[in-house]
């Protein structure tokens, strides 16, 4: 019989219900925005905005300062007071729409939903390792701003994204705001604009460049700005917007907008459609060719990637990649496939596609009928003409006008659908050693820290834990402070180490020591932990073998048993080859001689399951007693594996030595031609791994084996005669003298 060790699911080596408590701060209201600052003198701060209030926290998340940012019109509003005596606009709550650092000063800039979306600049004042905010400066000059032209109106109540770029000794605010007809009519924020902060911090320079959704499209064409970032020579905005100005406005897709970070102008504004799909390795019947589209971006982050992922993406290590979490629609719930998918768009590739798109539009020969696009921002036109014009005039350049690139950039889910039902609501990507890790917040208030690789059919978790008991969604914006990430959920801010909150969710020594080096996990006798958790017994270099099962559970006291041991950390090498003298198995007092691995039995074990098998031949010593005993596996002097060496002992109870007894055999005669069904009765007849009924030295083919009975078919006899009949268990004869008589057929 060919018994095989049962598979252990890979998930059994970890427990994601383990509770981790990470430092947190209760903000006293729903967190609306959060940003971090790290100075060069070890001073750092976390700025947390809620309705009508801005908190300044130290690196330990303790409150350092708190500032009233509303309600507008309230005498207690500290930011409002910076604008001089009011009234400055209609009274009302201030919801923070923008919270960014101006890298030039440094200073914090906050912009809210009240007071026409104006901003306030707070110089940073280091005090030891903490930072305080100086009295706010009101970035609003009343005499420069009108409802139809307001350089100081930055934030839209519908949402605004800002990236601040330092150019020379000046700060340029790259601003993208969601608009509708009502918002556009009230102190006219623009869809996309570049604003220069005035030297005296009294507001923004009056001459600023902007693009806005044309009035006729404001009602039907809504652009949501999901993320913005600056890398290299460009600032990028990521949007979710209707795929067409003329078609169904609920048919959405995702675009990347690119603006120059070195020339503060919008002539080289470019857009590119980002296409993210789930393409299962085995396509279902009826599933769309090329995979299922996930057109709506939920969150995004750009980061340099580690060596392994870089190789898989065919780019150089350290290159910047835009990662996006996409869903099928605004509600996020798909029909089939995972709830969330993650696609990776290398920035260099994005730039190349955009540049090629510009060439197609502007270089002869231009494909007839190729549109410049962006008809919601500008008059329709065909390439290479400028917007609204029939032809290029000599002093204009095709390249100096906004353009939608005619091709899209398509990518497939890095996780191959493995996020399953998880709804990702926050994303931050870091490079740790040569590993790229996605830190994701979820709809149900969990943090998933997962290695970003595309070649596997399972997720490589750093951690998966619940931030708290509220189960509220983790918010979109994540900030980094040193070796920690700050996530917001509900009214709380949580500080999560980038290397994971701990190691206790790894349940086995092998899984513990196979964890990434950056996690700092070690084995503490019977649990996985970081050194500070168990300084006494903590070690990272070896694991004992772990026996989980063996077969059979009993063997004959005389004769041998082929024992199969199941468990983990037997070999550390897939081949399962055991160097001489490293593995010692004893059953009771008796040794069990290791057997060479039968290469014909080797089968690939998928990483989602794991099990190791070890076989040995058990020959009980003469001193061995009948009865229950332990199986013990000791491994010593094993050469180290990639992550650790195997060293130690594992003991499992439940083996019994038994003495088989043969009580009766019938019938005691049969035809010489053979085929008589013999029934042997006794006790412990099924112990061990081998048994044989011999009739005159020839095997009687066993048809059934049980503890009390064996059935076999006699072999043909040479002559009519009485011949010896014996039972061997494990190669040793069971006591008793029996004969079988062959008769004429």
């Amino acid at each position: 019989e060919d018994w095989q060790c049962p598979r252990t699911p890979y998930a059994a080596s970890r427990d994601f219900d383990v509770k981790y408590v990470v430092p947190s701060f209760s903000a006293g209201g729903l967190v609306q925005a959060m940003v971090t600052y790290e100075g060069d003198r070890n001073e750092s701060a976390v700025f947390v905005a809620i309705r009508n209030r801005l908190h300044v926290l130290g690196p330990d998340l303790k409150s350092v300062q708190s500032l009233a940012t509303g309600p507008a019109g309230d005498p207690g509003c500290q930011t409002c007071a910076a604008c001089g005596p009011g009234p400055h606009g209609p009274p009302g709550d201030t919801d923070t729409k923008v919270l960014v650092l101006d890298p030039a000063l440094p200073a914090l800039v906050s912009c809210g939903s009240s007071l026409q979306g104006r901003c306030f600049l707070h110089d940073l004042e280091p005090q030891g390792t903490a930072v305080h905010l100086a009295a706010p400066a009101c970035l609003f000059s009343a005499h420069h701003n009108r409802p139809d032209d307001c350089p100081d109106c930055v934030a839209s109540p519908l949402g605004t994204r800002v990236t601040v770029v330092e150019q020379g000794q000046a700060s340029y605010f790259y601003v993208a705001s969601s608009l509708d007809a009502a918002v556009a009519a009230s102190f006219s924020p623009r869809s996309v604009s570049i604003r220069r902060l005035k030297a005296d911090a009294s507001g923004f320079a009056p001459g600023f460049v902007a693009l806005s959704v044309l009035p006729k499209h404001l009602v039907s064409y809504s652009i949501e700005y999901v993320h913005s970032f600056h890398t290299g020579a460009f600032v990028y905005f990521l949007t979710v917007q209707p795929a067409s100005v003329t078609d169904d406005p609920s048919a959405l897709h995702t675009r990347l907008a690119r603006l120059s970070a070195t020339e503060p102008e919008l002539g080289d504004y470019r857009e590119l459609v980002l296409d993210c799909r789930f393409a299962p390795k085995r396509r279902r019947r009826g599933a769309p060719e090329g995979g299922q589209p996930y057109p709506v971006l939920r969150v995004a982050h750009s980061a340099p990637v580690g060596a392994q992922l870089a190789t898989e993406l065919s780019i150089a290590e350290g290159q910047e990649v835009l990662f996006g979490v996409f869903v099928t629609g605004k509600d996020g719930g798909p029909g089939v496939g995972p709830n969330s998918v993650v696609c990776a768009f290398p920035i260099d590739l994005l730039d190349t596609l955009i540049d090629e798109g510009v060439e197609r539009c502007c270089e002869s020969p231009v494909h007839p009928g190729l549109r410049r696009g962006l008809d919601f921002f500008q008059s329709p036109s065909f390439c290479p003409n400028p917007p609204g014009l029939e032809a290029l005039s000599p002093n204009t350049s095709c390249r100096h006008f906004p353009l939608l690139v005619s091709s899209s950039f398509s990518r497939v889910d890095l996780f191959n659908g493995l996020l399953g039902p998880v709804q990702v609501t926050a994303l931050y990507v870091t490079r740790l050693d040569n590993v790229t890790v996605a830190h994701m917040g979820t709809m149900d208030g969990r943090i998933l820290q997962v290695e970003l690789v595309r070649s596997l059919n399972y997720l490589l978790y750093v951690s998966n834990f619940s931030l708290g008991d509220s189960g509220q969604p983790v918010q979109r914006d994540v900030s980094r402070l040193g070796d920690h990430l700050l996530f917001a959920s509900g009214d709380q801010v949580f500080q999560v180490p980038i290397q994971g909150p701990g190691c206790r969710h790894f349940l086995t020594c092998g899984r513990c020591l196979r964890a990434w080096h950056f996690m700092g996990c070690g084995w503490c006798g019977n649990m996985c932990g970081q050194q500070k958790e168990c300084p006494g017994s903590w070690q990272q270099d070896h694991c004992p073998p772990k026996l989980t099962e063996f077969h059979p559970h009993s063997g004959p006291l005389r004769g041998s048993t082929r024992l199969t041991l199941c468990g983990s950390n037997f070999y550390l090498h897939p081949s399962g080859l055991v160097p001489e003298g490293t593995h010692q198995v004893t059953v009771g007092q008796s040794p069990c001689r290791p057997l060479p691995k039968d290469s014909s039995k080797l089968r690939p074990v998928p990483r989602k399951d794991f099990v190791e098998e070890f076989e040995c031949e058990l020959e009980p010593l003469g001193t061995q007693a009948v009865g229950p005993t332990n199986v013990s596996l000791t491994v010593t002097n094993m050469p180290p594996g990639k992550h650790f060496r195997v060293d130690g002992t594992s003991v499992l109870r439940g083996f019994s030595f038994m003495e088989p007894v043969l009580i009766a055999v019938q019938p005691l005669f049969g035809p010489r031609a053979g085929g008589t069904c013999l029934t042997l009765e006794g006790q412990s007849l099924s112990v061990g791994t081998s048994r044989a009924v011999l009739v005159n030295g020839t095997e009687c083919l066993l048809a059934r084996v049980s503890e009390g009975q064996l059935l076999c078919a006699t072999p043909p006899g040479a002559t009519v005669a009485s011949v010896p009949l014996s039972l061997q268990v494990g190669g040793a004869q069971v006591p008793g003298s029996w004969t079988f008589q062959y008769r004429e057929d």
Partner: antibody
Framework: QVQLQESGPGLVKPSETLSLTCTVS????????WNWIRKPPGKKLEYIGY???????YYNPSLKSRVTISRDTSKNQFSLKLSSVTAADTAVYYC???????????WGQGTLVTVSS | DIVMTQSPLSLPVTPGEPASISCRAS??????????MNWYLQKPGQSPQLLIY???NQGSGVPDRFSGSGSGTDFTLKISRVEAEDVGVYYC?????????FGGGTKVEIK
């Protein structure tokens, strides 16, 4: 009140490296831009370059190959190094602070450096 | 680089009288609706001090008698009523393009 004070040798030999330090008091170099400007005899003020609070630098292209500006936040100082000097580098060297747009609101007293063998 | 030209080179003044210094840039120094022109005064034996930034904004602690105007390429610094302490060399500086560049200076002295 922010005060700046230049220090360094007043005489440097040709082909050697001119090194000056600007010590800032009454304010921190962890904010704003920290500039070097020079005035050769009988010539216009010439902008050399800056280092920002974050360590970002800019150098005048005419001097770029020879200039290094660095800072030491623990001492609240920033420094200028100008290599391979010639007599044309003889000037009064000033350090200055600006908050925005190269508008320098605080200046050091200036130090005369003569390049001569 | 943008070349800055000041005139006059020397300006004898009478206390209590107005005075005016001109500065011309070799190209427009306006952008974003702002003129990137700064004015400095270097008093005898002292380092320069910022008088005017962005063409018309007074520096911190600068007396009201100093004002700046102009746009494009032509700019003017006015002293409404000269005082004895106003003597020294006045410099204009553009900061629209890098490197920032200075005028040659105008020496103001009491008649």
């Amino acid at each position: 009140q922010v005060q700046l004070q230049e220090s360094g040798p007043g005489l440097v030999k040709p082909s050697e490296t001119l090194s000056l330090t600007c010590t800032v008091s009454g304010g921190s170099i962890s904010s704003g831009y920290w500039n070097w400007i020079r005035k050769p005899p009988g010539k216009k003020l010439e902008y050399i370059g800056y280092i920002s609070y974050s360590g970002k630098t800019y150098y005048n292209p005419s001097l770029k190959s020879r200039v290094t500006i660095s800072r030491d936040t623990s001492k609240n100082q920033f420094s200028l190094k100008l290599s391979s000097v010639t007599a044309a580098d003889t000037a009064v060297y000033y350090c200055a602070r600006s908050k925005y747009d190269y508008a320098m609101d605080y200046w050091g007293q200036g130090t005369l450096v003569t390049v001569s063998s | 680089d943008i070349v800055m030209t000041q005139s006059p080179l020397s300006l004898p003044v009478t206390p209590g009288e107005p005075a005016s210094i001109s500065c011309r840039a070799s190209e427009i120094v306006d952008n974003f609706g702002i003129s990137f022109m700064n004015w400095y005064l270097q008093k005898p034996g002292q380092s320069p001090q910022l008088l005017i930034y962005a063409a018309s904004n007074q520096g911190s602690g600068v007396p009201d008698r100093f004002s700046g105007s102009g746009s494009g390429t032509d700019f003017t610094l006015k002293i409404s009523r000269v005082e004895a302490e106003d003597v020294g060399v006045y410099y204009c500086q553009q900061s629209k393009e890098v490197p920032p560049t200075f005028g040659g200076g105008t020496k103001v002295e009491i008649k």
